[in-house]
Amino acid sequence: PPNRRTCVFFEAPGVRGSTKTLGELLDTGTELPRAIRCLYSRCCFGIWNLTQDRAQVEMQGCRDSDEPGCESLHCDPSPRAHPSPGSTLFTCSCGTDFCNANYSHLPPPGSPGTPGSQGPQAAPGESIWMAL
């Protein structure tokens, strides 16, 4: 379809780099959540940092191209990296408007399918790009 994809846009304070230029930020009349209209893909993404007690959103926005996973209707995150011991980054890609606003579910830390606690470690910030 010719219409462009619109996604939720968010970047946590301290995250290095930005995906802001992958789309056009929209004025939706409310402070949050922000919306971004994708330029180069029809695909949204989300990254969450899962620790023992909570999941915290790190980034949400547009992908720079359509890739496997972008055909998903919903955000179903999968584990990608370990920014620090006891936390795991989960990412999703999906291809409907605002599909990255929230995830459908996250597996509990340490459950099957989550990389073991001895998995690859990354410096803060770097891990976001590993996840993308």
């Epitope: 010719p2 219409n3 462009r4 619109t6 230029t21 056009e24 929209l26 004025d27 939706t28 009349g29 919306a35 209209r37 330029l39 180069y40 893909s41 720079d64 191209s65 359509d66």
Partner: antibody, heavy 117, light 111 residues
């Protein structure tokens, strides 16, 4: 200062392939934004042909999709247009332009391409 | 694709007068209330020059006598007081849907 410059043959024979180069200075084509080809027909109408983004993703005007190819050489900071099976209707001034988001903020001076035998 | 119709085709005015140019889209060019319509000026032998983006935002370096307004399908470019250098052809462009499309242009000529 961002500058774009088109180059290529000014005369192309019908049924052949039109090939143009856009050389960009003052900005890396891999840094950001998208790099477009736009043409202007003798009647002054403008047509967006397609782009290649900083990351290499490509989008074409559906009216040209079967004939157009846009590519790039990042080492030379150049991007290219190929348009196959040209006819007299492809005679136009061809511009390369940068799109900052979805509008065109920097343009080349344009090059006239005439399709004639 | 979205068709943009500009009117009038030619506008004959004198320096100092107000110019009002219209661009009508075959369907809405808004996304969640944001208008993806842009305006360019073109002089003979030159490429188009960006004046206004997203309906009403003035491009850096463009004089404040140029302004844009409108939403959904109807947009206007206004030149509050025509200067001699403003006599040119003006084009609208939409980017709400692929492919990007341009209007046919309005020529502003000296009366």
């Amino acid at each position: 200062q961002v500058q774009l410059q088109e180059s290529g043959p000014g005369l192309v024979k019908p049924s052949e392939t039109l090939s143009l180069t856009c050389t960009v200075s003052g900005y890396s084509i891999t840094s950001d934004y998208a790099w477009n080809w736009i043409r202007q027909f003798p009647g002054k109408g403008l047509e967006w042909m397609g782009y290649i983004s900083y990351s290499g993703s490509i989008s074409y005007n559906p009216s040209l999709k079967s004939r157009i190819t846009i590519s790039r050489d990042t080492s030379k900071n150049q991007f290219f247009l190929k348009l196959s099976s040209v006819t007299a209707a492809d005679t136009a001034v061809y511009y390369c332009a940068r799109s900052r988001y979805s509008w065109f903020d920097y343009w080349g001076q344009g090059t006239l391409v005439t399709v004639s035998s | 694709e979205i068709v943009l119709t500009q009117s009038p085709g030619t506008l004959s005015l004198s320096p100092g007068e107000r110019a009002t140019l219209s661009c009508s889209a075959s369907e809405s060019v808004d996304t969640y209330g944001n208008s993806f319509m842009h305006w360019y000026q073109q002089k003979p032998g030159q490429p188009p020059r960006l004046l206004i983006y997203r309906a009403s935002s003035l491009e850096s370096g463009i004089p404040v006598r140029f302004s844009g307004s409108g939403s959904r399908t109807d947009f206007t470019l206004t030149i509050s007081r025509l200067e001699p250098e403003d006599f040119a052809v003006y084009y609208c462009q939409q980017s709400n849907e692929d492919p990007y499309t341009f209007g046919g242009g309005t020529k502003v000529e000296i009366k």
